[in-house]
Interface confidence: medium
């Protein structure tokens, strides 16, 4: 949870001749006001897709009304700044949309009047947590000069506010892996002093003068890979005689994660998949209503009207979870045939074909099969930007001109003798044996060595394997 | 495809009170504006009260102001009419409607009908004295 942070410094006619002297010229008294819109990822979008991380509108600014005679001074600014609070992780990467808008107040028949005065796109790549960013960009011939940063709020921590520090009062500790924060250092426990040498990048601990191991890693000060230890795969705290590994808790031990949810380990930590109506890291966050906005990156919320009613979140596409928090990765399902390249652009997939290949899926082969001919009734099947005939019984070959014995290759067992056959092959099977390829033993008493009867059929139906 | 629905419509006495609400589906940009505007038999089409999406920014008719609040409910995608003190000159058929000042720079006005793209099928208010 955070919120991202935007100040307009100054907003007027930029340098240089033919720029404006008011935004009010010859129009009457009006006043600007600005519109902030931020959408995830660095892509170009249209300016009508929706703000998916979230948008705001400032006040009104003061009533300006152009002194003819005057220099033109820098016009009167709303006051405050520009939040849009973002609840899940902030991106890093995004698109910041500033637009300026002048409101006339002239005796207008129906209302005042609205315009667009000039919009700036920045695309940007910005850390939760850093200082103020300054910019100056020109829109035709205004400039707007303005600053901006993402900060986290509540417990959250780090460069996409995602981890959370723990106050002191809270009763448990700041916990592995958490280190004081920054804007807390008062408030969270110092992380407890490791054993002397202890691995900075492989150990870590819990009590002052450990040193554990994280996974993949072993010996006393967690510098040795576990590969070349006989404790391969086990976790926790380096045993001093044997420098193995003791089992040690894994980060979904315990199920952090409240509420019903469940808990998956990922690198180093974990992620929970919450139940409705919870939400979070922990999905310690409850109670929640479609009033509260719960329904992440555009999911449309419905729920009843009772207000501890329920609701469910429906995602639009590219994105799952009861809140509509987790992008699919929907190039992990891997659509792209014959080696292509799969890009998801977030609102379609798109694939790069290999050479010879193309189609949505790269699912055509351009030349394989063109021109070619299988003999003698074979089928040509396209693959691996070379042509491949499928042949029919009893012929072979890259064109299946060849004429093929099926009995070449010796398919009866035990002694069976083999006759080639117009529709593939016959096995005549030596006393005690059985099958289509006289592979099964027959006992003596009768009852043979027949594998469990596939499903469908009971120990007492005739078994048709011949 | 933008859908607006109407609800809450109906008979009052003078004096009385409705809340008429518009449930809003495919309509996502946020600097849009979602209204209210009313048209009684024979009459044109007046603005009544509009909010901007997102920004809180509202503006009301002389005629409404101080009896009637327009509000939203973003994550419901829902505007809300509020009519208090209702008169029997505030009979008319109440139409939801949502749109959008142009990028172009062209005017723009937040309470007259030209410029909203959507309009939904009305709701019946009638004040009788």
């Known amino acids: 949870a955070g919120v991202f942070e935007l100040q307009i410094h100054s907003f007027g006619p930029g340098p240089g001749p033919g720029a404006p002297r008011s935004p009010c010229s010859a129009r009457g008294p009006c006043r600007l006001f600005f519109r902030v819109c931020l959408k995830p990822g660095l892509s170009e979008e249209a300016a009508e897709s929706p703000c998916a991380l979230g948008a705001a509108l400032s006040a009104r600014g003061p009533v300006y009304t152009e002194q003819p005679e005057a220099p033109a001074p820098d016009l009167p600014l709303p006051n405050g700044l520009l939040q849009v609070p973002f609840r899940d992780a902030w991106p890093g990467t995004f698109s910041l949309i500033i637009e300026t808008w002048r409101e006339e107040l002239g005796d207008q028949i129906g209302g005042p009047a609205w315009s667009l005065l000039a919009r700036v796109t920045r695309r940007r790549r910005l850390a939760a947590g850093g200082p103020w960013a300054r910019d100056i960009q020109r829109a035709g011939a205004w400039e707007l000069r303005f600053s901006y940063r993402a900060r986290c709020e509540l417990l959250a921590v780090g460069t996409a506010c995602t981890r959370l520090c723990r106050p002191r009062s809270a009763p448990s500790r700041c916990g592995p892996g958490l280190r004081p924060c920054a804007p807390l250092e008062d408030e969270c426990e110092a992380p407890p002093v490791c054993r002397a040498g202890c691995s900075l990048e492989h150990g870590f601990c819990e009590q002052p003068g450990e040193c554990r191991c994280l996974e993949g890693w072993t010996g006393p000060l967690c510098t040795v890979p576990a590969s070349t230890s006989s404790c391969l795969g086990l976790r926790g705290p380096s045993s001093a005689t044997t420098g193995c590994l003791v089992p040690g808790p894994g980060p979904c031990d315990g199920n952090p994660c409240a509420n019903g949810g469940s808990c998956s380990e990922t690198p180093g930590s974990f992620e929970c998949t919450c139940p409705r109506g919870f939400y979070g890291l922990r999905c310690e966050v409850s109670g929640v209503t479609c009033a509260d906005g719960p329904c992440f990156n555009g999911g449309l919320c419905v729920g009843g009207a009772d207000p501890d009613s329920a609701y469910i979140c429906h995602c639009p596409p590219g994105f799952q979870g009861s809140n509509c928090e987790k992008r699919v990765d929907r190039c992990s399902l891997q659509p792209c045939r014959n080696g292509g390249l799969c890009l998801d652009l977030g609102h379609a997939l798109r694939c790069r074909c290999r050479a010879g290949f193309a189609g949505p899926r790269c699912e055509h082969n351009l030349d394989d099969c063109a021109g070619r001919a299988c003999a003698n009734g074979g089928t040509c099947v396209e693959g691996g930007g070379a042509h491949r005939c499928s042949c029919a019984l009893g012929f072979g070959g890259r064109d299946c001109r060849e004429r093929a014995d099926p009995c070449a290759a010796r398919p009866c067992a035990h002694g069976g003798r083999c006759y080639a056959h117009f529709s593939g092959l016959v096995c005549a099977c030596a006393p005690g044996y059985m099958g289509s390829r006289c592979e099964f033993p027959v006992h003596p008493d009768g009852v043979s060595a027949l594998p469990a009867a596939p499903p469908g059929l009971r120990p007492g139906d005739p078994q048709r394997y011949l | 495809e933008v859908q607006l629905v109407e609800s809450g419509g109906g008979s009052v006495q003078a004096g009385g009170s409705l809340r008429l609400s518009c449930a809003a589906s495919g309509y996502t940009y946020s600097s849009n504006f979602m209204g209210w505007f009313r048209q009684a038999p024979g009459k044109e089409r007046e603005g009544v009260a509009t909010i901007v999406s997102g920004g809180g920014t509202t503006y009301y008719a002389d005629s409404v102001r101080g009896r009637f609040t327009i509000s939203q409910d973003n994550a419901k995608n829902t505007v809300y009419l509020q009519m208090n003190s209702l008169k029997p000159e505030d009979t008319a058929m109440y139409y939801c409607?949502?749109?959008?000042?142009?990028?172009?720079?062209?005017?723009?006005?937040?309470?007259?009908?030209?410029?909203?793209?959507?309009w939904g099928q009305g709701t019946q208010v009638t004040v009788s004295s």
């Open positions: 409607a949502a749109g959008g000042p142009p990028t172009n720079g062209a005017k723009w006005y937040p309470l007259r009908p030209p410029g909203y793209n959507y």
